[in-house]
């Protein structure tokens, strides 16, 4: 469809409360430093304009792109260059450079303090003006995920208010708050992860690998439906992401709306779990959607033997539909396998491919492909092993010990990424065995491997920023399926030179005792990194004792009537006992 | 419910041609694959020719191939073969499958069609 005015299209579309929301959060997303009055001022002007051209399609300026309305907004501002730099350097392009020069310039890791959360002050801002409550919401999360899946944010920020519209009445607002607050915030955080990754796969390993991401996860939640259909939601998943990742925020919104109708009018033909989804309103709808359960696998499911090893016709289709062929056999291993990783279902059928790729040149091919399924039992015992032994590790360890035993692992792997980067990745890594240790066998695999998959693209996104390591670009780049094999498999790096041994580093003060008890974890874990970026080959005995001895003068000095004094007097002491230690 | 209905089948001298038709309503037959079947008396049902769904692919059995040409009008949702140079091994019933939501033919195993018509007899004799 073409309209004369795309901006009066989306808002009519979206309504104005959903168009301001995408509006507030594009902003926050390209001007990540911005005070949130300042954004409020820019999604005014912009919703008068949209309300303008609906008015009237023809008016001055209606018919133009927009990103160009949008990038006109922010070259406008008047302290770009003072606040952001470079990034005014893309207002001297023309569309399409100048939003792709915009896109180039978002802050994965934006020097933002961290939302702590207070709730009596909070609930007086919610009480006094919901609207700013809610948007101040969408603010402080897109500006510090700038890759944030926006239609998803919005649903987000309905819990957000509806969880300050029940406690805030109660007599215990902190009570009722702060858990609420910590769960919705973990659940906003994996959200941002999966997305980010989904960018990542779009933008640095094309839109090929992100439609065979989707058919692979798809296949498994939606096993009844049938290829054509799987196809389509893909096709259509692609145009939604790639439309959210290259922020065009509007646009994403109003098709992933048209994409949810299409799933609910079709549901008989796709899933019977999406019944109590579809009698929701617009973003609980697509939210219930995304997190659908899994359909129970259709009884008639043949042997994938018949058609992709024992038929005469394997090496025709495979030479005359190649990606059709290969799409297929990518379905009909995923619908039988929802027990496998996403990661893992496209490592087998890049197998598949290969082998086919190989025996189709040859004189006998179905003599060279016959055993061709045997090829994947390696690949499925890899991670199932890895992460049974990572499993009793963590029950042996408990949270903590298994994170710190990740961080020796990792630091020793990779001892050039920064301290900063070590600690956030490796203890996200060693939140694996509680989220899918205790979960089912058939469970586990999946939630691991896909849950390492998240935290691998923050540390290659982190990484791409500043690069400091070669074996991380390696894994990082050469496939996005094999990251995670391809970081479990660096053993430690001998070519890396020790770090001087840096006094300050392990200097400490009266702060520590107030922390709560993640940021004091968060300290002696950093002092651990750096510990062994100063000594690469210090043995396990001689780390346990560091930090044991770590935690007895943290102890110590905290429970003395002057916190700081101690530190002073007792901090030199402790640092020349490391170096005895490790000497 | 899909459901295909074929024509076309009768009496042929042998060197002689048919042309056998199938109607489908309840799919579009450009986006599923299609494929025609025959079973003689006495033997098991063995597939003759297929064209897949959305890819313009054919399929032929070893034993027809250069003799028949299975082709589809997607205007009509009809599915077509024609049969030249009849001999009198091709007499059977042919039957028309359907395989929706798949757009190739990556099975000649009858059992994997969930969709079939009643079929049509095509006797060769002199």
């Known amino acids: 469809d073409t309209y004369k005015s795309e901006i009066a299209h989306r808002f009519k579309d979206l309504g104005e409360q959903y168009f301001k929301g995408l509006v507030l959060i594009a902003f926050s997303q390209h001007l990540q430093q911005c005070p949130y009055e300042e954004h409020v001022k820019l999604v005014r002007e912009v919703t008068e304009f949209a309300k303008t051209c609906v008015a009237d399609e023809s008016a001055e300026n209606c018919d133009k792109s927009i990103h160009t309305l949008f990038g006109d907004k922010l070259c406008a501002i008047p302290s770009l260059r003072e606040h952001y730099g470079d990034l005014a350097d893309c207002c001297e392009k023309e569309e399409p450079e100048r939003n792709e020069c915009f896109l180039q310039h978002k802050n994965d890791n934006p020097d933002i303090p961290k939302l702590k959360p207070d709730p009596v002050a909070l609930c007086a801002d919610f009480q006094e003006d919901e609207q700013k409550f809610w948007g101040k919401y969408l603010y402080e999360i897109a500006r510090r995920h700038p890759y944030f899946y926006a239609p998803e944010l919005l649903y987000y920020a309905i819990i957000y208010k509806d969880v300050f519209s029940e406690c805030c009445q109660a007599a215990d607002k902190a009570a009722c708050l702060l858990p609420k607050i910590e769960h919705l915030r973990e659940k906003v955080l994996t959200s941002a992860a999966k997305q980010r990754l989904k960018c990542a796969s779009i933008q640095k390993f094309g839109e090929r690998a992100f439609k065979a991401w989707s058919l692979a996860r798809l296949s498994q939640r939606f096993p009844k439906a049938d290829f054509t259909e799987i196809s389509k939601i893909v096709t259509d998943l692609a145009k939604v992401h790639k439309e959210c990742c290259h922020g065009d925020l509007l646009e994403c919104a109003d098709d992933r709306a048209d994409l949810a109708k299409y799933i609910c009018e079709n549901q008989d033909t796709i899933s019977t779990k999406l019944k109590e989804c579809c009698d929701k309103p617009l973003l609980e709808k697509s939210h219930c959607i995304a997190e659908a359960k899994r359909d129970e696998l259709p009884a008639d499911l043949n042997p994938l033997e018949h058609d992709f090893v024992e038929d005469k016709e394997v090496c025709k289709n495979y030479k005359e539909a190649k990606h059709v062929f290969l799409g297929t056999f990518l379905y009909e291993y995923s619908r039988r396998h929802p027990d496998y990783s996403v990661s893992l279902l496209l490592r087998i059928a890049k197998i598949y491919e290969a082998t086919l790729e190989d025996c189709c040149a040859k004189e006998d091919p179905p003599a060279c492909y016959a055993t061709v399924f045997d090829k994947f039992q390696p690949l499925v015992d890899e991670p199932k092993n890895l992460i049974k032994q990572n499993c009793e590790l963590f029950e042996k360890l408990g949270e903590y010990g298994f994170q710190n035993a990740l961080i020796v692992r990792y630091t020793k792997k990779v001892p050039q990424v920064s301290t900063p980067t070590l600690v956030e990745v490796a203890r996200k890594l060693g939140l694996v065995g509680s989220r899918c240790c205790k979960r089912p066998e058939e469970e586990r695999l999946s939630c691991a491997e896909d849950y390492l998959s998240l935290v691998l693209n923050r540390l290659c996104v982190l990484h791409e920023k500043t690069p400091v390591s070669e074996k991380v670009t390696k894994c990082c780049t050469e496939s996005l399926v094999n990251r995670r094999p391809c970081f479990s498999a660096l053993t430690p790096d001998e070519t890396y030179k020790p770090k001087e041994f840096v006094e300050g580093t392990f200097t400490f003060h009266a702060d520590l005792c107030t922390l709560p008890e993640d940021e004091k974890q968060i300290k002696k874990q950093t002092a651990l990194v750096e510990l062994l970026k100063h000594k690469p080959h210090a043995t396990e005995e001689q780390l346990r004792t560091v930090l044991g001895n770590f935690a007895a003068f943290v102890q110590k000095c905290c429970a003395a009537p002057d916190h700081e004094a101690c530190f002073a007097v007792e901090g030199p002491k402790f640092v020349i006992e490391i170096r005895g230690i490790l000497a | 419910e899909v459901q295909l209905l074929e024509s076309g089948g009768g009496l042929v001298q042998p060197g002689g041609s048919l042309r056998l038709s199938c109607a489908a309503s309840?799919?579009?037959?450009?986006?599923?694959?299609v494929a025609w079947f025959r079973q003689a008396p006495g033997k098991e049902r063995e597939f003759v020719a297929g064209?897949?769904?959305?890819?313009?692919?054919?399929y032929y059995a070893d034993s027809v191939k250069g003799r028949f040409t299975i082709s589809r009008d997607n205007s009509k949702n009809t599915l077509y073969l024609q049969m030249n140079s009849l001999r009198p091994e091709d007499t059977a019933v042919y039957y028309c499958a359907a395989r929706p939501g798949r757009p190739l033919i990556t099975s000649k195993v009858a059992d994997l069609y969930p969709y079939w018509g009643q079929g049509t007899l095509v006797t060769v004799s002199s």
């Open positions: 064209i897949g769904g959305g890819v313009d692919i054919t």
């Open positions: 309840g799919a579009y037959i450009d986006e599923t694959a």
